[in-house]
């Protein structure tokens, strides 16, 4: 991927829209939308005060860890859906899109240098352990996906792209 493709706001906006659509189709869906188990996902709440004061490397750690855990969670959701007796087609479609979207975002972040940022000392050592919550429905899983993109990921890319502009 081109190194700064993710710095084009329309790129992230596309994935955000997909995540929002996925969240919307699961609104009011009970029968097909239970995960039947608790899946660990990143806590997407952002402490804006603390975030702004973090070094970009520390932000990268949080984003990279969160993205990894979220990808794992969505893959688990996909596996549960595949193994269910009658997977609901619209849900299947959006889960597949989310898996593909998270893969692409991982590639785009790697191209931006987020992985390098995340493992460079001293930031990696001082990063707080990733806060997590659990999701027991696809709605909550998609909500976490959407909030993660709107929150930490967007804040990080904004700062990383701005820093890279100088």
């Amino acid at each position: 991927a081109p190194p700064r493709l993710i710095c084009d706001s329309r790129v992230l906006e596309r994935y955000l829209l997909e995540a929002k659509e996925a969240e919307n189709i699961t609104t009011g869906c009970a029968e097909h939308c239970s995960l039947n188990e608790n899946i660990t996902v990143p806590d997407t709440k952002v402490n804006f005060y603390a975030w702004k004061r973090m070094e970009v490397g520390q932000q990268a750690v949080e984003v990279w860890q969160g993205l990894a855990l979220l990808s794992e969670a969505v893959l688990r959701g996909q596996a549960l859906l595949v193994n269910s007796s009658q997977p609901w087609e619209p849900l299947q479609l959006h889960v597949d899109k989310a898996v593909s979207g998270l893969r692409s975002l991982t590639t785009l972040l790697r191209a931006l240098g987020a992985q390098k940022e995340a493992i460079s000392p001293p930031d990696a050592a001082s990063a707080a352990p990733l806060r997590t919550i659990t999701a027991d429905t696809f709605r909550k899983l998609f909500r976490v996906y959407s909030n993660f993109l709107r929150g930490k990921l967007k804040l990080y890319t904004g700062e990383a792209c701005r820093t890279g502009d100088r």
């Epitope: 952002v46 402490n47 804006f48 702004k52 004061r53 967007k154 804040l155 701005r162």
Partner: antibody
Framework: QVQLVQSGAEVKKPGASVKVSCKAS????????MSWVRQAPGQGLEWMGW????????NYAQKFQGRVTMTRDTSISTAYMELSRLRSEDTAVYYC?????????WGQGTLVTVSS | SYELTQPLSVSVALGQTARITCSGD??????VYWYQQKPGQAPVLVIY???KRPSGIPERFSGSNSGNTATLTISRAQAGDEADYYC???????????FGGGTKLTVL
């Protein structure tokens, strides 16, 4: 002790500009973002924008974009907020507020009156 | 842009429990901050990160947040609690802070 001391009250005519200062003491000025919040008489708090004193980068509330400019002078640990094209609705107390884990330290406020 | 809605006023009998609400779209997914402001004074924070109290704030003050509503609870209300209370969070779409309209608490 840690404190923020703001400049005195101002009376301005509509269409003019006002520049309010906020002098920080008792802490490292460049280590904390600074926000500006205003409060019209009998009204609620309204966030205007923030400045990062270390880098000088800013972010303004949509409502004030194009009219507000936040700057700083690190040599004298002072933040400034300038509001242009004043109108009567801009009559308010303007506060600077340090961002710690929240808005932890506030200035005493500067009353800006816009009147013809 | 993101909006936070508070009731204009809340009344509570002395010694009873007051609850002040702050509504916003999916506010349960955000941290919420509560400020107390007395006439002629700058605001003072009473709750941060949704449910934490800074030192010096009595245990009577507590916060919670779920769904579309955050709540500031003041138990055993005292005359000195009379003030305006503001909730605050942020708009992630614009990276900006947002205050609620404020609630005037009256202790009867």
């Amino acid at each position: 002790q840690v404190q923020l001391v703001q400049s005195g009250a101002e009376v301005k005519k509509p269409g003019a500009s006002v520049k309010v200062s906020c002098k920080a003491s008792g802490y490292t000025f460049t280590s904390y973002y600074m926000s500006w919040v205003r409060q019209a008489p009998g009204q609620g708090l309204e966030w205007m924008g923030w400045i990062n004193p270390l880098k000088g980068n800013t972010n303004y509330a949509q409502k004030f974009q194009g009219r507000v400019t936040m700057t700083r002078d690190t040599s004298i640990s002072t933040a400034y907020m300038e509001l242009s094209r004043l109108r009567s609705e801009d009559t308010a107390v303007y506060y600077c507020a340090r961002e710690g884990m929240y808005f932890d330290i506030w200035g005493q406020g500067t009353l800006v009156t816009v009147s013809s | 842009s993101y909006e936070l809605t508070q009731p204009l006023s809340v009344s509570v009998a002395l010694g009873q429990t007051a609850r002040i609400t702050c509504s916003g779209d999916s506010i349960g997914d955000k941290y919420v901050y509560w400020y107390q402001q007395k006439p002629g004074q700058a605001p003072v924070l009473v709750i941060y990160d949704t449910n934490k109290r800074p030192s010096g704030i009595p245990e009577r003050f507590s916060g919670s947040n779920s769904g579309n509503t955050a709540t500031l609870t003041i138990s055993r209300a005292q005359a000195g609690d009379e003030a305006d209370y503001y909730c605050q969070s942020w708009d992630l779409d614009f990276n900006t802070y947002v205050f609620g309209g404020g609630t005037k608490l009256t202790v009867l």
